[in-house]
């Protein structure tokens, strides 16, 4: 064969991935591989994951002579060792005025009165602990409740007899019940006064309120 067909092991270099070719004989060569590669022509990226140290649930992803960690959302950093501050990342992590408290691997919400749940989005059912009188209907509010009384009952807890039931106010007066003590309050029409709106008044004085 002519000299132009002579095989020169390192020309061109068979070594890949930055490997350096060294001729070891007439027809032989050796590749000196860069760190992270192996094989007769440095064709293989060595898997660095068997010896990984990804922390806190991180998943190893092989690199070149190193590895990286794919972190769960609560962690960051090359090895997932850095805690993510969810309170900075999500300013509205806690609803309804709740206060965000960062923790290793997560966060917590300190809820204001009346709210509960991981993000303070659940209105506490105050009716669960309410003492509305049987027969009345409890309505849940934020950090409170109210009782809807059946006819004949009054007071915040519907525990009082409704004094208006006996129509104590005269002359077309408006009867209201004091929610604290159950007593009636007469709002007298023009020209009348007194607890029951039974007394005449001078012209010019109108709409008197009387409590009983």
């Amino acid at each position: 064969a002519g000299s132009d067909s002579l095989y020169v092991p390192c020309a061109p270099s068979p070594c890949v991935n930055g490997g350096t070719c060294r001729q070891t004989g007439d027809f032989t060569f050796e590749c000196n591989c860069l760190p992270g590669f192996e094989g007769s022509t440095c064709e293989r990226n060595i898997d660095d994951c068997p010896n990984h140290r990804c922390q806190n649930g991180g998943v190893c992803v092989d690199g070149v002579n190193t590895y990286n960690c794919r972190c769960p959302p609560q962690w960051t950093g090359q090895f997932c060792t850095e805690d993510v501050d969810e309170c900075l990342l999500q300013p509205n992590a806690c609803q309804n005025g709740g206060t965000c408290a960062n923790r290793n691997g997560g966060y917590g919400c300190v809820c204001v009165n009346g709210w509960s749940g991981d993000d303070c989005s659940e209105n506490i059912d105050d009716c669960a602990f309410a003492s509305c009188t049987p027969g009345s209907t409890c309505i849940d509010r934020v950090a409170s409740f109210s009782c809807m009384c059946p006819e004949g009952k009054a007071g915040l807890l519907c525990h009082l007899d409704d004094a208006c039931i006996s129509n104590p106010c005269h002359k077309g007066a408006l009867c209201d019940t004091n929610p604290l003590n159950g007593q009636y309050i007469c709002t007298c029409p023009q020209g009348y006064k007194g607890a029951d709106c039974t007394e005449d008044v001078d012209e010019g004085n109108s709409h008197h309120h009387h409590h009983h």
């Epitope: 140290r53 090359q78 090895f79």
Partner: antibody
Framework: EVQLVESGGGLVQPGGSLKLSCAVS????????MEWIRQASGKGLEWIAA??????????VYSASVKDRFTISRDTSKSTLYLQMNSLKTEDTAVYYC???????????WGQGTLVTVSS | DIQMTQSPSSVSASVGDRVTITCQTS??????LAWYQQKPGKSPKLLIY???RLQDGVPSRFSGSGSGTDYTLTISSLQPEDFATYFC?????????FGGGTKVEIK
Amino acid sequence: EVQLVESGGGLVQPGGSLKLSCAVSGFTFSDFYMEWIRQASGKGLEWIAAQRNKANDFSIVYSASVKDRFTISRDTSKSTLYLQMNSLKTEDTAVYYCSRDGGKLALDAWGQGTLVTVSS
Amino acid sequence: DIQMTQSPSSVSASVGDRVTITCQTSEDIYSGLAWYQQKPGKSPKLLIYGASRLQDGVPSRFSGSGSGTDYTLTISSLQPEDFATYFCQQGFKYPLTFGGGTKVEIK
């Protein structure tokens, strides 16, 4: 409070076997990498085995000096880490520590150690 | 395996002295370095992790620095309870490897 307590050490003849235990408390055992480290008298620290956490399928790594002779395992129901040591050699004589890998690339909690003596 | 070269192997110092211990690794460990203190008959105690972060409960006179392959532990003002042996450890990849130790003795 995080606590690790090793037991099971003692005197054993070359070629013999021994099983070390490490009872842990004060943390969620399955969440952490656990390691065995040993220290020959007056010498430095030598890492010998690790078991990763549940998130990493409790995968295991050994040092070349104990591979195929020692086995690391854990029983999460008993919160106990084990080191089964077979074909013991005189050079395995050391104090054996179990330690918790605290998620910081560092060993943040250690047991008090248990002495293993391999001698005829 | 990653080789750890710790120096000096021993140092004599007095209370109040500043003590510096160095640790060199055979390859980049991306700040995955920890420092431990060990007293005779006791188990090691973590002082510094992540090359420079102080473990909870460790006095602030201990500090760590470095990156890549070169790391340092400094005790700014040596106290009587600091006389002990100190080890560095790389946590970048298995096998975990430790420095040979530095014994801090009373001068």
